[in-house]
């Protein structure tokens, strides 16, 4: 039950995160005009990954796409790439995780297969979240660098007589959306990986077998085989199913798909 809840919650959190990454990528407000020097501007500039916009106080907004690839800064291209990779990985992760959900039955799919799919989607979500966070952080760093550069050259002109105010840009809403969305996707991915551990068959239990030595009545019972920790006694509170009413000689080991939680 806890595994199903963790998996389901991980899926939902990742879904919200990826929706946020898509929204952030499409948003125009990655950088917005810094209004520190002129809080009552009649013209407000803001820029996204795909186009730049100008909103006039008259109510008119004009947006122009970046109709060039080669003319764009390499950093912007890198941010675009990171965000797209994040979306693609996230989308694939979502697709995989849908089939991996414990609450959804697809034919006779083994739980081990579901565990593998859950782990795969979890890793995809983690990488997707990291891509988004990296993309947004690179853009934010670019903004900070440009902000201080333009602050240093804030006013230029002929002997200070004519002022040319350089437009400075600060963090836009899309950056915060991207950071939060990337974080959610990352958290969702971690939750999926945690859920995978609960889904995976941790051990194959070998049933107690008695070997009757002639003249002795000592029963030898080997401990359960543990895949992860090597040999040892079955100290965990695992259910060991008997094969029914059989003589001890007839008891065989039946690895059951119900042997894990």
């Amino acid at each position: 039950m806890a595994v199903t809840a963790c998996q389901g919650l991980g899926f939902v959190v990742s879904l919200i995160g990826i929706a946020g990454i898509i929204a952030a990528t499409c948003m125009d407000q990655w950088s917005t005009q810094d209004l520190y020097n002129n809080p009552v501007t009649a013209v407000f500039n803001y820029q996204g990954l795909w186009r730049s916009c100008v909103r006039e106080s008259s109510g008119f907004t004009e947006c122009r796409g970046y109709f060039t690839l080669l003319g764009l800064p390499a950093m912007l291209q890198a941010v675009r790439a990171l965000m797209i990779v994040g979306i693609v990985l996230g989308a694939i992760g979502l697709l995989v995780s849908i089939f991996a959900l414990k609450c959804i039955r697809i034919g006779s799919m083994e739980d081990s297969a579901k565990a593998n799919m859950t782990l795969t989607s979890g890793i995809m979500f983690i990488v997707s979240g990291l891509c988004a966070i990296a993309g947004v952080s690179v853009f934010a760093n670019m903004l900070v660098t440009n902000f201080w550069m333009s602050t240093a050259n804030m006013y230029t002109g002929m002997g200070g007589m004519v002022q040319t105010v350089q437009t400075r840009y600060t963090f836009g809403a899309a950056l915060f959306v991207g950071w939060v969305a990337g974080g959610l996707t990352l958290i969702g991915g971690v939750m999926m990986c945690i859920a995978c551990r609960g889904l995976a068959p941790e051990e194959t239990n070998y049933k107690a077998v008695s070997y009757h030595a002639s003249g002795h009545s000592v029963a030898y019972k080997p401990g359960g085989f543990k895949a992860s920790t090597g040999f040892g006694s079955n100290t965990k509170n695992k259910k060991i199913y008997d094969g029914g009413a059989r003589t001890e000689d007839e008891v065989q080991s039946y690895p059951s798909k119900h042997d894990y939680v």
């Epitope: 005009q33 002129n38 009552v40 501007t41 009649a42 013209v43 500039n45 803001y46 820029q47 730049s52 916009c53 100008v54 006039e56 106080s57 008259s58 109510g59 008119f60 004009e62 122009r64 004519v162 002022q163 040319t164 105010v165 350089q166 437009t167």
Partner: antibody
Framework: QVTLRESGPALVKPTQTLTLTCTAS????????MSWVRQPPGKALEWVAT????????YYNPSLKDRFTISRDISANQLVLKVTNMDPADTATYFC???????????WGQGTTVTVSS | DIQMTQSPSTLSASVGDRVTITCKSS????????????LTWYQQKPGKAPKLLIY???TRESGVPSRFSGSGSGTEFTLTISSLQPDDFATYYC?????????FGGGTKVEIK
């Protein structure tokens, strides 16, 4: 067609409050910023105030102090300018105008002349 | 505040003349976001409301005759009337539409020579 019509008292006593109304028609009132501009007799145009399309943002001429209040009634398609503590220096023709592309004022009312005198 | 300085304040010309009015701003009116200059030109006749001629420094308003043209960038702008017509005798104002407070120039009165 787009029409803007200002209305208000022609004569106001000093210290009184002036209320000017501009009634708009022929366009979607809530989609455009609206401005008040005044012109003292024989002088240049002077921008007074601007209000955004939805009425959320207002901008005032700081040189005219805090006596001016611009507002709009979208349901009635009306732009309102209130001026408190009127002074003889406020004697002017008051125009209302619609803001368009480039923040330019593309349509103007015919103007209403306000004289401040005791 | 951005100061707008127009010159000349009065201009005497004859019908058919080419007329140039200059407007200078104390700060650049060029917006880096769209590379447009937020300068507007108006024409006003006595007792009438101003009429929009040119916005974005060089974009002619619809219905405005082609003899009116605007040019310039940054801080220096000009309004040119290629061939002055009797209907063009009026006062012309430039306006900063880039930053609040919106400011007008002192006006240039074009009168008959």
């Amino acid at each position: 067609q787009v029409t803007l019509r200002e209305s208000g008292p022609a004569l106001v006593k000093p210290t009184q409050t002036l209320t000017l109304t501009c009634t708009a028609s022929g366009f979607t009132f809530s989609s455009y910023g609206m401005s008040w501009v005044r012109q003292p007799p024989g002088k240049a145009l002077e921008w007074v105030a601007t209000i955004s399309g939805g009425g959320s943002y207002t901008y005032y001429n700081p040189s005219l102090k805090d006596r001016f209040t611009i507002s709009r009634d979208i349901s009635a398609n009306q732009l309102v300018l209130k001026v408190t503590n009127m002074d003889p220096a406020d004697t002017a023709t008051y125009f209302c105008a619609r803001q368009s592309r480039g923040n330019a004022m593309d349509y103007w009312g015919q103007g209403t002349t306000v004289t401040v005198s005791s | 505040d951005i100061q707008m300085t127009q010159s000349p304040s009065t201009l005497s010309a004859s019908v058919g003349d080419r007329v140039t009015i200059t407007c200078k701003s104390s700060q650049s009116l060029l917006n880096s976001g769209n590379q447009k200059n937020y300068l507007t030109w108006y024409q006003q006749k006595p007792g009438k409301a101003p009429k929009l001629l040119i916005y974005w420094a060089s974009t002619r308003e619809s219905g405005v005759p082609s003899r009116f043209s605007g040019s310039g960038s940054g801080t220096e702008f000009t309004l040119t009337i290629s061939s002055l017509q009797p209907d063009d005798f009026a006062t012309y104002y430039c306006q900063n539409d880039y930053s609040y407070p919106l400011t007008f120039g002192g006006g240039t009165k074009v009168e008959i020579k």
